[in-house]
């Protein structure tokens, strides 16, 4: 379905003459009849097969026609179809002297007619108008014309419906061509599908409307990608909907019970160390001066005897003062008001004076320390032993009882493992970090080359001049069978032949 | 596929018993650690019970320590939750599960369910 446009632009008649040449009185009224038929070689008179248009009276003589309606009529004229524009056309223009109001053919004189054209060729549908015009010995007409698609027509021939729609079966507009073209947000064949939010999941999403991201049951979040964990589900996650996969640190079906209580809660107090020891259970090692089951509470600071030299302690809000005895002071009474003269040191420790006997120091014997000889010295308190040995305090001296594969005065020797001999069979011995290996001689395996291996003793050939070997399996070794005339281990020596008898 | 079906369920009267079994396919039992969990109407499931792919370890939840015991027949793919002294509280469906792994530590695969009614 289309329309065939026809634009009269000027018709020059300069005498006034109708077409048998005879004047118009008083000048000729002018009007136009239109037919627009199939395509003919010849364009002849008949049915005008694709529409007849006329118009009102434009003009007297000559005249330019208005591109707009006039007097009832319209320019461009319309010649409407509804079938499938061809593409080839025939039009014949005839321009009418109108004497009175009646401008019907049967009405008019037929000497009426002031010129006839009549044209045909090809025309595709299009925008663009094509200028044309016609001229006889007497008149002149300039027009134009071009053939358009009614609305919702589209195509080379106008064959094509497609009208736009934005509803529940389609969301589109028209291409020049009639292809749909689908409204922002919409896709598919006949743009029904929504274009769901950028990023929404594909499976586990879906969407009514474009930008839109709706879940599918398990799953959630904006772009449905996230999956919904078994309910009930307290430190877990899933990879897939309802499972509950628990966080590191928490046990049970629905990971509710807490098998890091220390991570999690933090119990212990005032610097202590916290170990877990089950489910919601846990230990605290305490800081020097702290105690409680969490290290909660404070030991008194005089618990731990900062007063030296028979100094009194006194608790305190702030700390604690050590009252000092006669002869002492300081913060810890560590220092001394006293001489070798006051027999300072005990435990039979030697006094030295100091600063000109102002001061004075104590050489302790073995067994003590402390600035008066005062405290018996453990001599374990240094870790001295090594390798894991347990230190045991003797009277005066101390002892290291050693773990296994070590000795020395302080477990730092080594023990070789090889001491022993532990290579059976002549084996070799090799010590090693964490203990020893056997390099085994031929015919022996085993970790301590205890096991006897048969070994073929005849393998090197050692018989010799044909003789047969045997292998003695109970000593592994070998036995040669000598042929006749040879002798020896090895069957390596001849004998001399015996003398040949006469007889 | 995971199957986990189980049997057993009814109606009991308080402090009677019922013993659940939870057949299991589609997988190597001895590798999973197998739970029981319930869930009443309106309320949020709770975990009762698990053991240890090896049945070495089980866990109870409080409410029901002392009262039932869980345990596994590897030759037949099935996990037992014995109910003894049962209470009205104990009234739900009865799930058996697996995290899917030897612990017993959270869920993967669950079964259809089994009630358990408690009432006089």
């Known amino acids: 379905s289309g329309v065939f446009q026809l634009q009269l632009q000027e018709f020059i008649n300069e005498r006034g003459v109708l077409a048998s040449g005879r004047p118009c009185e008083p000048g000729c009224r002018t009007f136009f009849r239109v037919c627009l038929k199939h395509f003919q070689a010849v364009v002849s008179p008949g049915p005008c097969t694709f529409g007849t248009v006329s118009t009102p009276v434009l003009g007297t003589n000559s005249f330019a026609v208005r591109d707009d309606s006039s007097g009832g009529g319209r320019n461009p004229l319309q010649l409407p179809f509804n079938f499938t524009w061809p593409g080839t056309f025939s039009l014949i223009i005839e321009a009418w002297h109108a004497p009175g109001d009646d401008l019907r053919p049967e009405a008019l004189p037929p000497d009426a007619l002031i010129s006839k054209i009549a044209i045909q060729g090809s025309l595709a549908v299009g925008q663009n108008w094509l200028l044309d015009e016609q001229t006889s010995t007497l008149t002149r007409l300039r027009y134009s014309y071009r053939v358009i698609c009614s609305d919702n027509y589209y195509g080379d021939n106008c064959s094509r419906l497609c009208k736009k729609r934005n509803d529940h079966f389609g969301h589109y507009v028209c291409q020049p061509d009639g292809n749909l073209s689908c409204l922002p947000g919409w896709t598919g064949e006949y743009c029904q599908q929504p274009i769901c939010l950028s990023g929404c999941h594909e499976q586990n999403g879906y969407c009514s409307k474009p930008a839109e991201c709706l879940c599918r049951p398990g799953w959630q979040g904006r772009l449905c990608n996230e999956c919904i964990p078994h309910n009930g589900c307290r430190h877990g996650t899933c990879s897939t909907p309802w499972q509950c996969t628990c966080d590191e640190g928490w046990g049970g079906l629905f990971c509710d019970q807490d098998l890091n209580y220390c991570t999690h809660h933090s119990p212990c107090k005032n610097g202590a160390t916290c170990s877990n020891s089950g489910q919601r259970s846990y230990t605290c090692t305490c800081r020097p001066g702290y105690t409680g089951v969490d290290c909660e509470l404070e030991l008194s600071e005089c618990d731990s005897n900062p007063c030296r030299n028979g100094g009194s302690c006194k608790d305190q809000e702030d700390g604690y003062h050590c009252l000092c005895p006669p002869g002492y002071y300081g913060l810890h009474c560590e220092h001394s008001t006293l001489s070798c003269a006051d027999s300072p040191c005990f435990n039979g420790g030697s006094c030295r004076e100091r600063n000109q006997g102002a001061n004075y120091a104590c050489e302790c014997p073995p067994n003590f320390t402390g600035s008066n000889c005062e405290k018996k010295v453990d001599r374990c308190t240094s870790n001295p032993c090594a390798n894991g040995g347990q230190c045991l305090n003797r009277g005066p001296s101390r002892m290291c009882r050693c773990r296994p594969g070590f000795t020395g005065t302080y477990c730092e020797l080594h023990v070789s493992d090889c001491a022993r001999n532990p290579c059976a069979h002549g084996g070799t011995c090799h010590d090693l970090e964490n203990g020893l290996m056997c390099t085994c001689p031929a015919g022996f395996s085993g970790r301590r080359c205890e096991v006897r291996t048969s070994i073929d003793a005849c393998a090197s050939s050692p018989c010799f001049n044909r003789a047969t070997c045997y292998t003695d399996l109970s000593t592994d070794t070998f036995v040669c069978n000598c042929p006749y005339g040879f002798v020896g281990s090895r069957c390596e020596f001849p004998v001399g032949l015996p003398p040949s008898f006469p007889w | 596929e995971v199957q986990l079906v189980e049997s057993g369920g009814g109606l009991v009267q308080p402090g009677g018993s019922l013993r659940l079994s939870c057949a299991a396919s589609?997988?190597?039992?001895?590798?999973?650690?197998i739970g029981w969990f319930r869930q009443a109407p309106g309320k949020e499931p709770e975990g009762i019970s698990c053991?240890?792919?090896?049945?070495?370890?089980?866990y109870y939840t409080d409410s029901v320590k002392g009262r039932f015991t869980i345990s596994r027949d590897n030759a037949k793919n099935t996990v037992y939750l014995q109910m003894n002294s049962l209470k009205p509280e104990d009234t739900a469906v009865y799930y058996c599960?697996?995290?899917?792994?030897?612990?017993?530590?959270?869920?993967?695969?669950t079964g259809q369910g089994t009630q358990v009614t408690v009432s006089s």
């Open positions: 599960a697996t995290p899917g792994i030897a612990a017993c530590r959270g869920i993967h695969y």
């Open positions: 589609g997988f190597t039992f001895d590798d999973y650690a």
């Open positions: 053991i240890s792919s090896s049945g070495g370890i089980t």
